[in-house]
């Protein structure tokens, strides 16, 4: 940091800088294609790099597709390197889902394949893990291509829009279970293709208007099968097909694997699919009441042509204090022989650690322990398991890469902790195919740094991107600083972060904006470097932007995370208010100018806080908030709240609404914002807040964004919302 004794003449980070992305963080997005090579796009050429030596050659020149006539959205190389799949005509659907057109380029013949093309409006395509088979989903049915230039084999015939989904997820499975559109899983050698089939026949539809172009006289109505809390859920079936025995004159034979008996007794979800070996697959199933899950391990039986899941190999995972997993049960990482696996589960103390399972034994052995958590298992070799955790220096908001020796669990090495401890405290990793090399991606607290390493001796090979150009540019900008610390409430540490204005002076009084999310297993206090709206508010407007991880937040054990079980809208809301009270006691906060804002769950918490009548907050902004949990989707809501029935938790569903707090909004200034085409948190939620406020005579401000979804991310809407919110905050804080 520059320490200027005289007035700092450098420019600040402005709202325009944020909206126009003036200062861009450089990424280094590589794609591993083997254990020692990766692809990287440079000036639109695709280069192939040797990891050991760093030398590169042109894999595909940018001129290759000059005559293609379409703007290529993405590409994917077949595992054998013979073909490249080109994606164009991209049309977004929901968070992950989209349709697109595809063409296949033959890298040997150096020409596009023109016969037997994949149809337009394809919903998902994926190469087999080896070779060049393709599986794709079109019109909710699955097709397989054995050769890119030959006709496809149709695998399913039951697909029906909004009713039966083969190989792709419906809305709720996409958003809340798999975080993906794909519901297809190739076996490691590409012989078998496993897939889920979802049936939404009885799932109620959410309907909303889509206004589209001004010339459209009557708005379109969008209808989406969307199960709200307590409503009829989709049902699921699971199948495996052998793609080595497909024929053009017979229908493909899909063998069903049914859910365990303990699941079939009631509503349930398929929540994880992991291939263990070429002929062994593990499935995890979860009850609708998400405190009980079962893993089945199923083997292919050649003599019968069936998949057998032995009851003796079932592994039950349950929670007595909340729900299973952070958001769902974690995935298993199998050893090469498929006879054992490693999995992140909650230990006796409620911290998430790695446990070693043998498939035929019920109990597992924890290989990590401590008052910290394993975030993810990143790679497994014959000798080591690599994982990311937040153990280092007891900072839940940090992330580092570790390796543990499988022959001696006491031998643990942190591979990233000491590489660049000031600059880098938050790492993610990308391993080569067999984990011989890895890319470390440091995302803070300093500028992002990308480096390449060898697993043989864990030595750093080279810097891939250090953002030095951005660093040089930011030297000329008065940038905020970031403080990460904790407060102690009831003998428990709770972490917060503050984005502090340039030349922060603790003897001065600053307005404070509390930036909140506070959903279950969330984390807003971390060591990540960001250039965002908060950067502008702190740099240009001299506002402190703070975030606090209270009860319900993640990565600090289940005591904290499960505190809000069955009680959304209580402790996590109260803790944000308490945090603001604590901040206002710090001496540098103007307690007459404290605001709060949040999006989605953060919008809900913001609204609940503002409706609490605490007197702590002058104003606040809720973007796309939940307002009543019966309006939100079943999978997410019921995980934490159970069912909205008198026998279960209806009372708390009813007393955790924003609308019931309407009267208290008379004491605050409130800005309510929502996109009219929000498929996730429906416009209905804000419409009901608005109605309740109007009914009790509360004056408030509101903005809708026509045809915008939950992200309000179109270029014009994004700029408008942040400009609008900036005006509101400045007015609230009496800033010029």
């Amino acid at each position: 940091h520059h320490h200027h004794h005289h007035a700092d003449s450098r420019k600040t980070y402005t709202l325009t800088d944020y909206l126009k992305n003036t200062y861009r963080l450089k990424l280094y997005s590589l794609r591993w294609i083997s254990d020692h090579e990766y692809l990287y796009k440079q000036e639109n050429n695709i280069l192939v790099f040797n990891a050991e030596y760093g030398n590169s050659s042109v894999f595909l020149e940018n001129s290759t597709f000059d005559e293609f006539g379409h703007s290529i959205n993405d590409y994917s190389i077949s595992p054998d390197g013979q073909f490249i799949l080109l994606e164009y005509n991209y049309v977004k659907q929901w968070r992950h889902s989209y349709t697109a057109s595809y063409d296949i380029y033959d890298l040997n013949k150096r020409q596009l394949i023109t016969e037997e093309r994949i149809p337009n409006n394809t919903q998902w395509v994926t190469w087999s893990p080896v070779g060049h088979k393709l599986a794709y989903v079109w019109n909710n049915d699955i097709y397989v291509k054995i050769e890119p230039n030959l006709p496809s084999y149709r695998i399913t015939w039951t697909g029906k829009e909004d009713i039966i989904y083969n190989g792709i997820t419906d809305w709720v499975y996409e958003e809340e279970v798999f975080s993906a559109y794909s519901a297809l899983w190739w076996s490691p050698n590409g012989t078998f293709l496993a897939y889920a089939q979802f049936n939404d026949t009885e799932v109620p539809l959410i309907e909303y208007s889509f206004y589209s172009d001004e010339s459209l006289q009557y708005p379109k109505t969008v209808r989406v099968p969307y199960p709200k809390a307590g409503a009829v859920n989709p049902t699921v079936k699971f199948f495996v097909v052998n793609t080595d025995s497909l024929s053009s004159v017979t229908n493909a034979t899909s063998i069903q694997i049914t859910a365990p008996a303990s699941m079939l007794i009631g509503d349930h979800y398929l929540c994880d699919v992991t291939w263990a070996t070429q002929e062994r697959i593990s499935l995890q199933w979860l009850r609708r009441i998400q405190n009980y899950s079962v893993m089945d391990i199923c083997d292919y039986d050649e003599s019968s042509g069936r998949w057998n899941c032995l009851v003796a190999r079932q592994h039950i995972e349950m929670s007595t204090t909340g729900w299973v997993g952070r958001f769902r049960p974690s995935e298993p990482h199998f050893t090469l022989d498929g006879n054992s696996f490693y999995k992140i589960i909650s230990n006796e103390e409620g911290y998430r650690h790695i446990c070693y399972f043998q498939i035929d034994k019920k109990d597992c052995t924890f290989i990590t322990k401590g008052t910290w958590e394993v975030i993810g298992i990143e790679a497994l070799t014959s000798d080591y398991l690599y994982y990311i955790s937040n153990e280092y220096k007891g900072m839940p908001g940090g992330r580092n890469l570790y390796k543990i020796q499988l022959s001696d669990y006491t031998k643990v090495t942190c591979l990233s902790c000491e590489l660049n401890p000031e600059r880098c405290q938050y790492y993610s990793v990308s391993f080569s195919k067999e984990a011989k090399y890895y890319q470390l991606r440091c995302s803070g607290p300093g500028l992002p740094l990308y480096t390449l390493h060898s697993s043989v001796n864990d030595k750093g090979l080279r810097v891939l991107e250090d953002n030095s150009a951005l660093d040089k540019m930011l030297q000329n900008v008065q940038m905020p600083s970031k403080k990460l610390d904790f407060i102690i409430l009831n003998e428990t540490k709770f972490w917060y972060q503050m984005i502090l204005p340039p030349h922060f002076d603790k003897s001065k009084k600053y307005p404070l904006l509390l930036d909140v999310y506070a959903g279950p297993c969330s984390q807003k206090a971390d060591t990540v470097f960001r250039l965002n709206w908060a950067t502008y508010l702190a740099s240009t407007e001299n506002i402190i932007v703070a975030s606090f991880d209270g009860r319900g937040s993640g990565y600090q054990g289940d005591k904290i995370m499960h505190a809000i079980n069955r009680r959304l809208g209580t402790f996590e809301v109260e803790d944000q208010i308490e945090a603001a009270r604590q901040f206002s006691k710090m001496g540098f906060v103007d307690n007459k100018r404290i605001a709060i804002w949040g999006w989605s769950y953060g919008g809900y918490v913001t609204s609940m806080v503002l409706g609490s009548g605490s007197g702590v907050f002058k104003c606040g902004i809720a973007v796309a908030p939940v307002s009543r949990w019966e309006y939100y989707d079943s999978v997410y809501t019921e995980r934490y709240m159970g069912l909205p029935t008198p026998e279960d938790n209806l009372d708390h569903y009813r007393n955790s609404t924003v609308m019931s707090r309407a009267e208290n909004f008379k004491q605050v200034e409130y800005l309510l914002i929502h996109g009219t085409a929000d498929d996730n948190v429906h416009f209905q939620q804000s419409a009901q807040i608005s109605k309740a406020l109007v009914d009790v005579g509360v004056d408030f401000q509101a903005m809708w964004y026509t045809d915008e979804d939950h992200g309000i991310a179109s270029s014009t809407a994004h700029q408008h919302i942040y400009t609008h919110m900036s005006h509101f905050i400045k007015q609230c804080f009496s800033l010029p």
Partner: antibody, heavy 117, light 107 residues
């Protein structure tokens, strides 16, 4: 080596039934479909239908529904086709074949079924 | 069902001769056309799939071509073992259907 070994020739009377077999070897029987075809002298081969030994799934050509019944015995890796209510029109050579990819890649040697009073 | 019409039904030819067999479909079959050989002893094997792709192990003197409804099989230079029946078959729609066959015989 992949082989489909069919049973011997049949001479039978109108109205009766006949069951012919096709024993598979050299590949995993439960993995692949088994198809059946009819060939009358001087006429085109006709597709009767197929069975998947693993799932028991069957697909018939509409024309042969009620005429042909396909079954398998997994323990002996054998597929069977029963032809019922036989008429002289059913006199033909019947083949079993393994459909794979775009073709019928392996064929049995054929069974001559003669229906005569 | 799609009707496959083969011509000629009989094709007398000499060793070393180039012969072509035709096959017409009653509707477009988008290249989904295969050829089979049936030897005098009744054994049947595939020769060509998807109009022009050679089945593994089939000599390169066999070739196929065509599009839409019209397809052909060519043997560039007849060998003694090539005297046999040849059938075309479509797999564009169910049920798969065959032509009545062409007998290539020694002139």
């Amino acid at each position: 080596e992949v082989q489909l070994q069919q049973s011997g020739a049949e001479l039978t009377k109108p109205g009766s039934s006949v069951k012919i077999s096709c024993k598979a070897s050299g590949f995993t029987f439960t993995t692949y479909d088994i198809g059946w075809l009819k060939q009358r002298p001087g006429q085109a081969l006709e597709w009767i239908g197929y069975i998947n030994p693993g799932s028991g799934g069957i697909g018939y050509n509409e024309k042969f529904k009620g005429k042909a019944t396909l079954t398998v015995d997994k323990s002996s890796s054998t597929a069977f086709m029963q032809l019922s209510s036989l008429t002289p029109e059913d006199t033909a050579v019947y083949y079993c074949a393994r459909p794979l990819r775009r073709v019928l890649d392996y064929w049995g040697q054929g069974v001559m079924v003669t229906v005569s009073s | 069902d799609i009707v496959m019409t083969q011509s000629p039904s009989s094709l007398p030819a000499s060793l070393g001769e180039r012969v072509t067999i035709s096959c017409r479909a009653s509707q477009g079959i988008s290249n989904k056309l295969n050829w089979y050989q049936q030897k005098p002893d009744g054994t049947i094997k595939p020769l060509i799939y998807y109009t022009s792709r050679l089945q593994s192990g089939v000599p390169s003197r066999f070739s196929g071509s065509g599009s839409g409804t019209d397809y052909s099989l060519t043997i560039s230079s007849l060998e003694p073992e090539d005297f046999a029946m040849y059938y075309c078959q479509q797999d564009a729609s169910f049920p798969p259907t065959f032509g009545a066959g062409t007998k290539v015989e020694l002139k």
